[in-house]
């Protein structure tokens, strides 16, 4: 099977299998520096469920900015340029990390925390109830 | 005017505005009770930009499996639901946070690691390059 | 000390491209969003884009295709680059950080540099 | 894009005065709205922030007030060296936008 190796110069903590309180490293290390950054920007005017950016601010978060998708339209945006009520424009979501200050208004004293935000919109097919 | 409070137990800590190793506490806290997941469980297959969820996982990084979006389609599922080449299918992506384990194999010490995911698809109107 | 500083060529012709340099030093470009701004010679301000701390960008829709916003955070330094440029384009460009103690805001500006679009 | 209605785009006050200047934006901006203030020749200086934050080092006279859609900026008694052109700035929403400034001169 695989075994996991573990490494002898590790700091010291009581519970080896989930440790409840860990130290962390706010030194961010970024993984994306070979993309594009412009590789995705203007989606969310091109989209057929275009979206605006709106702000949610939380100090006591980290990151205490985060920017959210709200779908311009009920309906999606048909080959006219005209929104077709026939579809929906729908959030796409996703749970995050972030860390919450603990107790609050600590610099150094986190909790890890999950949390739902909307990431872009997506055109779908609507789900047709009909009535008996 | 804003008053920006400080609570008098935190622990202690030698930069007070950006630290750079912080305790974590990894019982995590789930803001998301109250919504359904279910609620966009099924966006991917009703978008007329449909996407497949792949797995990504790896042991040295909480979490340790994240479910990655790939589009099925380089264009888009129209009204008859044939794939649309004159539309684009493309992913929305959203940088996330990680713990990375730091050094590595080490249960209780991480870094904390800025990863780029794609969530799910989009559809798009192409840029059209016009060749003078 | 916070300090931003633009750099750029000053005068470019008409449908030519530009690049202005903003260089930042006392703080750490992976740490802080930078935003773009400019200003029209005698009108008012008006935002260009952001270059988020993990390096995404978001920028205005009317200039989106003509204009990139990319960083080197090892050099301190972001990049604002301007394609078919026009005169139009003529105006102060200024780089400021969003930072704050609590909230967040535009706390530090550049002093501007300033484009001239002309033949 | 949530447009910024700045009033008035000009106004003559003594000195000592109180002053107060208004932006109305055109969607809830849930009080993401900064002031600045602008002197010839030189980059705008951020004097409020999130619509009531005194930014460090900005002399208390200055304030500013609102929500949803309607802001104030007010000065409470005039000095000669608050001369000059303010603007608010909306940051709720993508694009960021300004109004379109207030030149403020001496009476």
């Known amino acids: 099977g695989i075994t996991i190796p573990r490494n002898p110069g590790c700091p010291n903590s009581e519970d080896k299998n989930f440790p409840r309180t860990v130290m962390v490293n706010l030194n961010i290390h970024n993984r994306n520096t070979n993309t594009n950054p412009k590789r995705s920007s203007d989606y969310y005017n091109r989209s057929t469920s275009p979206w605006n950016l709106h702000r949610n601010e939380d100090p006591e978060r980290y990151p205490s900015v985060i920017w959210e998708a709200k779908c311009r339209h009920l309906g999606c945006i048909n080959a006219d340029g005209n929104v077709d009520y026939h579809m929906n424009s729908v959030p796409i979501q996703q749970e995050i990390l972030v860390l919450r200050r603990e107790p609050p208004h600590c610099p150094n004293s986190f909790r890890l925390e999950k949390i739902l935000v909307s990431v872009g919109c997506t055109c779908v097919t609507p789900i047709v109830h009909h009535v008996a | 005017g804003i008053t920006i409070p400080r609570n008098p137990g935190c622990p202690n800590s030698e930069d007070k505005n950006f630290p750079r190793t912080v305790m974590v506490n990894l019982n995590i806290h789930n803001r998301n009770t109250n919504t359904n997941p279910k609620r966009s469980s099924d966006y991917y297959n009703r978008s007329t930009s449909p996407w497949n969820l792949h797995r990504n996982e790896d042991p040295e990084r909480y979490p340790s499996v994240i479910w990655e979006a790939k589009c099925r389609h380089l264009g888009c599922i129209n009204a008859d639901g044939n794939v649309d080449y004159h539309m684009n299918s493309v992913p929305i992506q959203q940088e996330i946070l990680v713990l990375r384990r730091e050094p590595p194999h080490c249960p209780n010490s991480f870094r904390l690691e800025k990863i780029l995911v794609s969530v799910g698809c989009t559809c798009v109107t192409p840029i059209v390059h016009h060749v003078a | 000390q916070v300090q931003l500083k633009e750099s750029g060529p000053g005068l470019v012709a008409p449908s030519q491209s530009l690049s202005i340099t903003c260089t930042v030093s006392?703080?750490?470009?992976?740490?802080?969003?930078i935003h773009w701004l400019r200003q029209p010679p005698g009108k008012g301000l008006e935002w260009l884009g952001v270059i988020w701390a993990g390096g995404r960008t978001h920028s205005d829709s009317a200039l989106m295709s003509r204009l990139s916003i990319s960083k080197d955070n090892s050099k301190s330094q972001v990049f604002l680059n301007v394609h078919s440029l026009r005169p139009e384009d003529t105006a102060i460009y200024y780089c400021?950080?969003?930072?704050?103690?609590?909230?967040?805001?535009?706390?530090?500006w550049g002093q501007g540099t300033t484009l001239t679009v002309s033949s | 894009d949530v447009k910024m209605t700045q009033s008035p785009s000009s106004m003559y006050a003594s000195l000592g005065e109180r002053v107060t200047i208004t932006c109305k934006a055109s969607h809830d901006i849930n009080s993401y709205l900064s002031w600045f203030q602008q002197k010839p020749g030189k980059s705008p200086k951020t004097l409020i922030y999130r619509a009531n934050g005194l930014v460090d080092g900005v002399p208390s006279r200055f304030s500013g007030s609102g929500s949803g859609q309607d802001y104030s900026l007010t000065i409470s008694s005039l000095e000669y060296e608050d001369m000059g052109v303010y603007y608010c700035l909306q940051y709720e929403m993508l694009p960021l936008t300004f109004g379109a400034g207030t030149k403020l001169e001496l009476k």
């Open positions: 400021a950080r969003e930072g704050g103690d609590y909230y967040k805001y535009l706390d530090f």
């Open positions: 006392g703080f750490s470009l992976i740490n802080y969003d």
